[in-house]
């Protein structure tokens, strides 16, 4: 908190300019009018103030706008944004994508800070949903943004926004998140032809059910092992050896290297050894020949 002192004669700021960097903190407090600062916020970013001086400028804005800054000021905060707390940001009503971009630019190259997370949350809540332009912007600055959202939050993503998602945006998503995103992606890409469809849907397949994987196996998609390993175990288990062979195409040979890892390990345990042998990969652990397989889940469903 800066003490209230009278502004020395001749030092009253007529505009926000570089001469202010020579002011002591108390002089900034006494000589810079908060309303002048608010109307010339765009200039602050072009002046190399110290962190201590920025604290004073923030304090002046806080006094002028105790209920939260107007968007006209927020858009030009620049590096002053780094001084804001999540509590400050919760008072804001940010509706313009340009404002969001301007503030994300300030934080560019850094981890997502609590301030940025709060800003994004306020922005998205204000819009009511994650539209394509917003998603485009957020994933450009933070590729992992989508995977930081809860399944509930992801449910507000309209299918049209899925077009903005790049494979790397889904790298850190867990199965619960992909369960929500996959149906949206399926809807978004439904009018594409086979090979183009697979290229687009591939990143989302960690949320695909068995029937969709069976359908894909009929389309010569040649799924790579990395994608296969991210599939839901419960979706892979019912696939036959023939279906997996068709699904993977030439990549089927990679199963040998992954035979001890999920979902391959669990899938092998469900297959007849005879069927696994037809692959010629030396996969072991299948059901020995002559054994009867009881599908207990089916039995439970019938009882």
């Amino acid at each position: 908190e800066v003490e209230k002192t009278a502004c020395p004669s001749g030092k009253k700021a007529r505009e926000i300019d570089e001469s202010l960097i020579f002011y002591k903190k108390w002089e900034l407090e006494a000589c810079v009018d908060a309303a002048l600062l608010a109307t010339q916020m765009d200039r602050v970013n072009a002046i190399p103030f110290t962190y201590e001086q920025l604290d004073v400028l923030k304090h002046k804005l806080d006094e002028l706008y105790p209920q939260g800054y107007p968007e006209s000021v927020i858009q030009h905060l620049g590096y002053l944004f780094l001084k804001m707390s999540p509590e400050d940001i919760r008072k804001w009503n940010v509706t313009s994508l340009e404002t969001l971009k301007a503030l994300l630019e300030v934080n560019k190259g850094h981890e997502m800070s609590p301030q940025v997370a709060t800003l994004i949350d306020r922005f998205v809540k204000g819009r009511g949903q994650l539209d394509k332009d917003t998603l485009d912007t957020l994933t450009a600055f933070y590729p992992g943004y989508l995977c930081s959202l809860s399944p509930e939050e992801l449910s507000s993503v309209p299918p049209s926004s899925i077009w903005a998602v790049r494979p790397q945006d889904l790298d850190t998503c867990d199965p619960r998140q992909l369960d929500v995103l996959y149906p949206k992606a399926r809807l978004a890409f439904q009018n594409m032809n086979g090979s183009e469809y697979f290229v687009k849907i591939q990143s989302f397949l960690g949320g695909a059910p068995t029937e969709d994987l069976k359908a894909l196996s009929q389309q010569n998609v040649s799924m790579d092992l990395a994608t296969f390993m991210k599939l839901r175990t419960d979706a892979v288990l019912p696939l036959t050896v023939a279906e997996v062979q068709k699904l993977l195409g030439p990549h089927v040979e990679g199963l040998k290297a992954e035979e001890r890892h999920r979902p391959v390990r669990d899938w092998i345990l469900r297959q007849r050894q005879d069927d696994l042998d037809t692959l010629g990969l030396g996969l072991q652990g299948g059901i020995p020949n002559g054994y009867l397989v009881l599908d207990l889940s089916m039995q439970e469903a019938l009882s």
Partner: nanobody
Framework: LQLVESGGGLVQPGGSLRLSCAAS????????IGWFRQAPGKEREGVSY????????NYADSVKGRFTISRDNAKNTVYLQMNSLKPEDTAVYYC??????GGQGTLVTVS
């Protein structure tokens, strides 16, 4: 992306030093640069300023006529020529480019 200050040292009163502020990872052409200093136990204060084009310069009253700020965009460096140094100029000197100083600074001791 950072600014690196150099050129500080121990100098006798009345002596001179030239400080350099070099940019690493980005070009300084588009940025206004400020030199600041902070003496032990004192508030950090602005010393000098130069606009991105170099056409506009400004100085704190305490250094006017003794310090000169200049820039060489080809070398990606801004300089602070300090003449007629006084004991009260003793401080850590920092440079900043359109955002608060982030460098380690360079120590100038006048004694």
């Amino acid at each position: 992306l950072q600014l690196v200050e150099s050129g500080g040292g121990l100098v006798q009163p009345g002596g001179s030093l030239r400080l350099s502020c070099a940019a690493s990872g980005f070009t300084l052409d588009y940025f206004a640069i400020g030199w600041f200093r902070q003496a032990p136990g004192k508030e950090r204060e602005g010393v000098s300023y130069i606009s991105s084009s170099g056409g506009s310069t400004n100085y704190a009253d305490s250094v006017k006529g003794r310090f000169t700020i200049s820039r060489d965009n080809a070398k990606n460096t801004v300089y602070l020529q300090m003449n007629s140094l006084k004991p009260e100029d003793t401080a850590v000197y920092y440079c900043a480019a359109d955002w608060p100083p982030g460098g380690q600074g360079t120590l100038v001791t006048v004694s």
